[in-house]
């Protein structure tokens, strides 16, 4: 048999025999096109892409539609893995999504849903999620059913504002919303209260921001 | 009254550390937290970081990250603050500073008198 | 970071006339910021937090207003102790300062 060279996620690698957390290179579905992006082996069984992390406020995450597209920051910190691949990626199977979380008082919790996709550019990246179980919460902090996604320079969200620019960061904002792990970052003493934090409603309610998020995904028949 | 007295300068050469201490006198030590503050020859001023002097409990800039170390003695009341790997750039006086609020994180009330630290080969 | 924008760098005023100094935050702050004092060889003063609320033992003729991004410092009638260095803070997200505006004697 042939030893698999390119890889479409994490679980892919994974499997192949390469079992170390750390910066891979994946391809794109049906494409020679190429992104890195931090896999995470060791938690749940492995296999996991890591899509979003959020550490401490390193990396500026108001950002463009295009920057949000394509993806930025450093896959070894901060970064958004980009909504491109993931809208690809999450189309050709069944993905769950889990999202892990910090609070600063050294407390974690993780809302997991067992089906996960992102819809194409035309409909703007709009998520869709199906069964939530985990501790962050037992109502979805992302609204549901799942809104379009908006950054600074693309308002698609439902409110007569623009919730990205008033709340900072790329989400898929209702109006706005109980969530937004792109928000500002504030360090700890600065949590409380903020509008515009990286929050989690359903967890933490409105005003806290957390200290750590991670957005990881895998194949739901790992 | 509130007062917080802070080591001699010191001159050390590039790669050498540095350990600067505040005394702090005239308020609950471990009630309020600790900054510090940098500020190079004719310069402005830079937050380096801070420290719960009663659980010990830090916080830094990211500038200095792996620099950096903020400790305290609570039998002396005294907080301190060391940075290794000195550059020239790293000459400046250094101050410490109390938190006005332990709620708000906010403004520093009282500050030290300053620690003139020179980097020189 | 947050990046705060002080003007002018100097300023120059006769003693009993107003001086008004200005300070712009990069994003939204909220209430959180403070005005220090400082003169040459010593520690910094903190003079108004709160963006308008004076601290213990600072004069009246020291007045703070503003919130968000834009905020103003404003001295009603220099007396001569009052030329020095002046720095505004942000405490909303991180602890940032101003590169200062001097006042000095026309």
């Known amino acids: 048999k042939e030893e698999q060279t390119t890889f479409r996620d994490c679980a892919e690698i994974f499997k192949s025999g390469l079992t170390t957390s750390g910066i891979y290179t994946l391809t794109f579905p049906n494409s020679t096109e190429e992104i890195k992006a931090y896999c995470d082996m060791e938690a749940g069984g492995g296999g996991w892409t890591i899509i979003q992390r959020r550490e401490d406020g390193s990396v500026d995450f108001q950002r463009t539609w295009k920057e949000y597209k394509v993806g930025f920051g450093n896959p070894s910190g901060e970064y958004w893995l980009g909504n491109e691949f993931v809208s690809q990626l999450t189309n050709q199977q069944r993905y769950v999504l889990k999202i892990h979380l910090k609070d600063w008082e050294g407390n974690e919790a993780y809302s997991l849903y067992e089906h996960f996709y992102l819809s194409s550019e035309e409909l703007n990246y709009r998520i869709h999620l199906k069964g939530l179980t985990g501790t962050a919460g037992k109502i979805s902090s992302i609204s549901q059913p799942g809104n379009d996604f908006s950054t600074k320079d693309g308002d698609n969200d439902k409110c007569i504002c623009k919730c990205s620019q008033m709340l900072t960061g790329g989400w898929w904002f209702d109006a706005c919303g109980p969530s937004n792990l792109n928000g500002m970052y504030y360090p700890q003493r600065q949590n409380t209260n903020k509008f515009n934090g990286i929050k989690w409603y359903y967890w933490k309610g409105s005003g806290y921001s957390l200290k750590a998020t991670t957005m990881m995904i895998r194949p739901a028949d790992f | 009254q509130v007062q917080l007295v802070q080591s001699g300068a010191e001159v050390k050469k590039p790669g050498a550390s540095v350990k600067v201490s505040c005394k702090a006198s005239g308020y609950t030590f471990t009630g309020f937290y600790m900054y510090w503050v940098r500020q190079a020859p004719g310069q402005g001023l830079e937050w380096m970081g801070w420290i719960n002097p009663n659980s010990s409990g830090t916080n830094h800039a990211q500038k200095f990250q792996g620099r950096v170390t903020m400790t305290r003695d609570t039998s002396i009341s005294t907080a301190y603050m060391e940075l290794s790997r000195l550059r020239s750039d790293d000459t400046a006086v250094y101050y410490c500073?109390?938190?006005?609020?332990?709620?708000?994180?906010?403004?520093?009330?009282?500050w030290g008198q300053g620690t003139l630290v020179t980097v020189s080969s | 970071e947050i990046v705060m924008t002080q003007s002018p760098a100097t300023l120059s005023v006769s003693p009993g006339e107003r001086a008004t100094l200005s300070c712009r935050a990069s994003?939204?702050?909220?209430?959180?910021l403070a005005w220090y004092q400082q003169k040459p060889g010593q520690a910094p003063r903190l003079l108004i937090f709160?963006?308008?609320t004076r601290a213990t033992g600072i004069p009246a003729r020291f007045s703070g207003s503003g919130s968000g991004t834009e905020f103003t410092l404003t001295i009603s009638s220099l007396q001569s102790e009052d030329f020095a260095v002046y720095y505004c803070q942000q405490y909303n997200n991180w602890w940032t300062f101003g590169r200062g505006t001097k006042v000095e004697i026309k």
């Open positions: 709160g963006a308008s």
């Open positions: 500073a109390r938190d006005q609020d332990i709620a708000t994180a906010g403004p520093f009330d009282y």
């Open positions: 994003q939204s702050v909220s209430s959180n």
